[in-house]
Amino acid sequence: MKVLQEPTCVSDYMSISTCEWKMNGPTNCSTELRLLYQLVFLLSEAHTCIPENNGGAGCVCHLLMDDVVSADNYTLDLWAGQQLLWKGSFKPSEHVKPRAPGNLTVHTNVSDTLLLTWSNPYPPDNYLYNHLTYAVNIWSENDPADFRIYNVTYLEPSLRIAASTLKSGISYRARVRAWAQCYNTTWSEWSPSTKWHNSYREPFEQH
């Protein structure tokens, strides 16, 4: 049994880091493998993660961590029974993938303005809470070409757009994702999408 693709990990910079790797053949990850992780810190304890299958030869493990700080560094050991297959390390602050925003809501009752709001996925005491920026994706269910991205570079988790910038009388969907420049993070996953019917009164044309 050998590791074909070494573990790569990302942290949500809160409580979970996710590591993925590939073996050289079909593997029952949960029965055959264990990923050990230990914070490189005074008197830290070692922890065992039981991986799940992620495709035939792929494995994924969700490492539970206490509140992460930028200096944190973990040793990682991948074991098959009593055989050490791979040894490495992981610094969560250098591999951050933020949590996806939640509770995306479209408010359509604001005088021909669409107000999109969502929730910041972090509690106020987390460093990323005040450092997230967002991308909002709006697309038409009827017209694949009608696809747009709005970058929200301010901290407030909301976006206002004129309803008239979208076509009237058709359904749209929206989703939102987050990233943090301070840690040069990757983008989060997209939030679940929400759907609404876009309708607004066309202004009377003057002849």
Epitope: R34, L36, Q38, V40, F41, L42, L43, S44, E45, A46, D77, W79, L84
Partner: antibody
Framework: EVQLVESGGGLVQPGGSLRLSCAAS????????MSWVRQAPEKRLEWVAI????????YYPDSVKGRFTISRDNAKNSLYLQMNSLRAEDTAVYYC??????????WGQGTTVTVSS | DIQMTQSPSSLSASVGDRVTITCKAS??????LAWYQQKPGKAPKLLIS???SLETGVPSRFSGSGSGRDFTLTISSLQPEDFATYYC?????????FGGGTKVEIK
């Protein structure tokens, strides 16, 4: 070369106090956690106090908690162990040791503490 | 607390002998184990960490093996300066605990 030299051991009566010192050299003292490890006659090695490099975190096993206090002076490259309310079972050789997160990578020669009336 | 049991507690051997010391843990440590050497009146010295990794400056006649609960320290060809007491220590879970020691004496 890393050197750790303990001093301050001796004979003390039960209930008495003693202060051990450890002079460190040959490494950047403030960058390392330090510890006191003891070995009682016919007993196992046992760590009794640990302090972080900056001195802001300290750790004790239940056997000495509330009686022993570890401290350090990074400007003087010195480590200390204040031992109060000493008991006969605290009789041991006390070693100053540098802690590499989880194991002890350099040790001093030890100083003997005898608690007896 | 994790219990560490070393065996034998003492052994007699001659220069050139192959010596094996075992350390058994009360629970699975994977490879979170260190070995120390202590000569009479001297400071203990770290020999091995991670069950198998030799520390810088430690002679290659020393080797560590094992994982899980059973670990071994081997001296391939005993030298006069190797007569000492050897201890194992687990760092899987705090409080980190030591074995009772194995005294290697001259036959």
């Amino acid at each position: 070369e890393v050197q750790l030299v303990e001093s301050g051991g001796g004979l003390v009566q039960p209930g008495g106090s003693l202060r051990l010192s450890c002079a460190a050299s040959g490494f950047t003292f403030s960058s390392y956690a330090m510890s006191w490890v003891r070995q009682a006659p016919e007993k196992r090695l046992e760590w009794v106090a640990i302090i972080s490099g900056g001195g802001d975190s300290t750790y004790y096993p239940d056997s000495v908690k509330g009686r022993f206090t570890i401290s350090r002076d990074n400007a003087k490259n010195s480590l200390y162990l204040q031992m109060n309310s000493l008991r006969a079972e605290d009789t041991a050789v006390y070693y100053c040791a540098r802690l590499h997160y989880w194991y002890f990578d350099f040790w001093g020669q030890g100083t003997t503490v005898t608690v007896s009336s | 607390d994790i219990q560490m049991t070393q065996s034998p507690s003492s052994l007699s051997a001659s220069v050139g002998d192959r010596v094996t010391i075992t350390c058994k843990a009360s629970e699975d440590l994977y490879n979170r184990l260190a070995w120390y050497q202590q000569k009479p009146g001297k400071a203990p010295k770290l020999l091995i960490s991670g069950a198998t990794s030799l520390e810088t400056g430690v002679p290659s006649r020393f080797s560590g093996s094992g994982s899980g609960r059973d670990f071994t320290l081997t001296i391939s060809s005993l030298q006069p300066e190797d007569f000492a007491t050897y201890y194992c220590q687990q760092y899987w879970r705090n409080p980190y605990t030591f074995g009772g020691g194995t005294k290697v004496e001259i036959k």
